[in-house]
Interface confidence: low
């Protein structure tokens, strides 16, 4: 039209940048200096949207619109019939956003309960609070931006998740339509992957006022405030053998372990979570006796031929032997067994109790030469045990005359005036001239569940050499990792899955020298020690007959040493390095060092 | 953060009886084993009663034996120690205390006062 | 009854100073000894346990020694805030018994 110019209009206000559901969205068409025409305004969208233009009298005019839903609108402003510029303008128009109506919960937000390393989570909810777009940011200690996943649930709700990547104090920021939600953001103490002082052990088998020798005992072990760690329990019976130990997942943050201490004496029981010491680990425990192990007989059969009531001085090698005892008489208690071979190592073993108040010990003898058999009831020998047998090879003829009257042969012979000892002879030697043989196999249970992939382990010597441990999946949430020690001293032990450490790995742990029949000496005070702190270790000299033992300890410094009988056959050695340095550790029984002795610690 | 809090102490008469109690919060109480322990006015301490994480077990010195009772609720996290017969010999500031036995006293309450006089 | 007997009833000593206080059992208790600290106006607090375990939480200057029968509880570089009795206690075996208590005051 003459006198009209539309590329003189002016359109400006919120209303074309974006604009909101159900209210009133504004802007201001100008037309001053565009001369004279007829203002058109029409909307496009999602929905019917409600419009109106009030004329200010100078030259402009004040527009508004309501879009009732949220969606894409186009405004087309004409000015005598052709569009101004910028026309028609594209407006994004959201619904009402209220993000104080957000609410945001759950673990991952909550004091004491966010563990670094382990996966975290969080709800966002949203469903009251319009639709806009959701930011959540997540930082560490030290201001760094740490991932994060944002998964929409489809029902109003978001789950957030991320993974703190180590302790210290965390921010986690929420943004709803660029606006931070209540409390946010949010301050979070992110706690160490595991926390081994937060773990009790208590029930009936730490209980130190002594439990039942031979009888099963259990304790419960509750992580639930402790975090991932790895559980390792090991239990050394009164002379530092490791005792054979279950553990149970209870899948609730506890564990129930299970053992039985089949010999009177004291117990000690380590508890590590994620590597750590619990509080008051180790636990020390007394078995005390049950029944009355003299009221016990003892008969034995070899591959199914009675011998009477006493136990034969030969077997022969490969053949199943069974030793049955009457325990009628001697009240509550069970029966338990070993069977020590030549070289110190010890024998599989199976009890089995019987209806008739009876117990069938069964055992094969691998290799020849002399066995010592312990039969206990209620933790105490039973009378002339423990016995010694002497197995043969199959062409080999019993040099030995049949005992009269089929005696028991205990391992003790006395002659007036003293006590004449046997012991085996001495096995072979090993590393470092040590005896190999008597460095135990140990099972470590760990809690663990497989769910697909590889678990593997890897054990660093303290030569350096690296060994592979066996690893059983116990298919109850555990596993079992199973490792035959050749050398002692500090280990490193690497459990992966799918190459991945498990919580609580590498693990460490010592090595000393057990076996059966002689003197023998353990203890991390043989390995290792720390300046001004009693270092200290065991001597054990149970199976050792009468004799003296003597303690040096040579290095830089003097060291105190304290010895303590234990009177179980055992004592406990205590001295003080007060420089640091190699010592020497000499023990000797009656003028001959023990297995391994000197020690460097 | 674990918090045991005593209460039930008071002033009684030689022969008469008292309740007391200890709140615990702040940590799996069922899983705690728990002792009471006293203070005397000559500040010594004294070992009084212990009590399983169950229930089960209890031990006393033969100094309140047959006279003190320890009990619990585990659902209501509560310990409690029934005395009769009191003694003026008992007067003493009474505290709970996690474990013993097993282990030492880790957790100790701030104690309620027990005075035993005619 | 296991009678754990602390010789001293009261100890002096000096900010700084090393200080070490003993305690004795009358039968052996192997290593199930602890130690505790008792300020004024407040119940005891756990520091020690198994002898020469330090509990969750203590200042590596506290440290515990001994076995058997003779234990020594050991504070090197002694600060205001230690002032306090310190109790020894057996756990080997009921009823549980705990030593006098030794005062540590400032010289």
């Known amino acids: 039209t003459e006198g009209c110019d539309p590329s003189r209009v002016r359109v400006h206000g919120p209303g074309i940048q974006s604009g909101t559901t159900n209210k009133p969205n504004k802007f201001t068409v100008e037309t001053r200096g565009a001369g004279t025409g007829g203002l058109g305004l029409a909307v496009e969208g999602p929905s019917e949207a409600k419009m109106s233009c009030m004329d200010n009298k100078d030259g402009s005019c004040s527009v508004e619109y309501i879009p009732y839903e949220a969606g894409t609108y186009s405004l087309n402003v004409t000015y005598g019939g052709h569009q101004v510029p910028g026309s028609p303008f594209k407006v994004p128009v959201h619904d009402v956003t209220d993000a104080s109506k957000v609410k945001c919960s759950g673990p991952g937000l909550s004091p004491g309960m966010v563990r670094a390393n382990l996966p975290q989570s969080f709800q966002v909810d949203t469903s009251k609070a319009g639709v806009a777009p959701l930011q959540v940011k997540v930082q560490g200690p030290k201001g760094l931006v740490e991932p994060v996943d944002v998964v929409d649930n489809a029902d109003g709700t978001q789950t957030v998740n991320y993974v703190p990547s180590r302790e210290g104090p965390y921010s986690i920021s929420v943004l709803y339509g660029d606006e931070e939600v209540p409390r946010s953001p949010f301050k979070v103490k992110v706690l160490p992957t595991h926390d081994a002082s937060k773990v009790k052990a208590s029930g009936p088998g730490l209980n130190t006022t002594g439990v039942p020798a031979s009888l099963p005992v259990e304790f419960t072990i509750d992580a639930k405030d402790a975090g991932e760690g790895l559980l390792a329990v090991q239990i050394t019976d009164p002379e530092g053998k490791p005792k054979k130990t279950h553990i149970q997942d209870n899948h609730d943050g506890t564990y129930t372990v299970a053992y039985v201490p089949d010999v009177t004496g004291r117990y000690t029981i380590l508890i590590k979570y994620g590597g750590d010491e619990i509080p008051f680990s180790p636990y020390r425990v007394r078995a005390v006796p049950t029944g009355d192990a003299s009221k016990c007989t003892v008969t034995v059969s070899i591959g199914g031929h009675g011998l009477g009531a006493g136990i034969g001085p030969t077997i022969q090698i490969g053949e199943e032997t069974v030793i049955t005892v009457d325990t009628k008489a001697a009240g509550k208690g069970k029966v338990t067994c070993t069977v020590c071979t030549p070289d110190g190592s010890e024998v599989d073993v199976d009890v089995v109790e019987n209806e008739d108040g009876t117990f069938d010990i069964f055992y094969t003898a691998p290799q020849p030469g002399k066995y010592v058999i312990c039969v206990r009831f209620g933790g105490e020998h039973v009378p002339n045990s423990p016995f010694q047998v002497t197995a043969l090879a199959g062409d080999q003829p019993s040099v030995q005359p049949p005992l009269r009257s089929q005696q028991l042969a205990p391992q003790y012979t006395y002659a007036q005036g003293g006590q004449q000892t046997w012991a085996p002879e001495r096995p072979l030697v090993g590393v470092n001239g040590l005896d190999v043989t008597s460095l135990r196999p140990f099972d470590l249970v760990i809690p663990f569940t497989i769910k697909k992939g590889e678990i593997t382990g890897e054990v660093r010597m303290p030569s350096g050499k690296v060994a592979q441990p066996t690893i059983t999946d116990n298919k109850d949430g555990t596993v079992t990792v199973r490792y035959a020690p050749s050398e002692a001293g500090l280990h490193e032990m690497d459990i992966r899955y799918d190459n991945m450490h498990i919580p609580g790995s590498p693990l460490q742990f010592y090595v000393d020298y057990v076996n059966c029949g002689h003197v023998t000496a353990y203890g991390p005070g043989l390995t290792h020690g720390v300046v001004n702190k009693p270092a200290t270790f065991t001597v054990n000299t149970k199976d050792a007959g009468e004799g003296g033992l003597s303690l040096a300890i040579e290095g830089p410094s003097k060291a105190e040493i304290s010895c303590t009988d234990n009177q179980d056959g055992t004592c406990s050695v205590s001295y003080l390095p007060v420089l640091p340095g190699d010592y020497s550790i000499l023990v000797k029984y009656n003028e001959q060092h023990v297995p391994g002795s000197p020690f460097t610690a | 953060e674990v918090k045991l809090v005593e209460s039930g102490g008071g002033l009684v008469q030689p022969g008469g009886s008292l309740k007391l109690s200890c709140a615990a919060s702040?940590?799996?109480?069922?899983?705690?084993?728990m002792s009471w322990v006293r203070q005397t006015p000559e500040k010594r301490l004294e070992w009084v009663a212990y009590i399983s994480n169950g229930g089960g077990s209890t031990y006393y010195p033969d100094t309140v034996k047959g006279r003190f009772t320890i009990s619990r609720d585990n659902a209501k996290n509560t310990l409690y120690l029934q005395m009769s017969s009191l003694k003026s010999e008992d007067t003493a500031m009474y505290y709970c205390?996690?474990?013993?036995?097993?282990?030492?006293?880790?957790?100790w309450g701030q104690g309620t006062l027990v005075t035993v006089s005619a | 009854d296991i009678v754990m007997t602390q010789s001293h009833k009261f100890m002096s000593t000096s900010v700084g100073d090393r200080v070490s206080i003993t305690c004795k059992a009358s039968?052996?208790?192997?290593?199930?000894v602890a130690w505790y600290q008792q300020k004024p106006g407040q119940s005891p607090k756990l520091l020690i346990y198994s002898a020469s375990h330090r509990y969750t939480g203590v200042p590596d200057r506290f440290t515990g020694s001994g076995s058997g029968t003779d234990f020594t509880f050991t504070i090197s570089g002694v600060q205001a805030e230690d002032l306090a009795v310190y109790f020894c206690q057996q756990h080997y075996s009921t009823p549980l018994t705990f030593g006098a208590g030794t005062k540590l005051e400032l010289k």
């Open positions: 702040g940590f799996t109480f069922s899983s705690y084993t």
């Open positions: 039968q052996d208790v192997s290593l199930d």
């Open positions: 205390a996690s474990d013993g036995i097993i282990r030492p006293f880790a957790y």
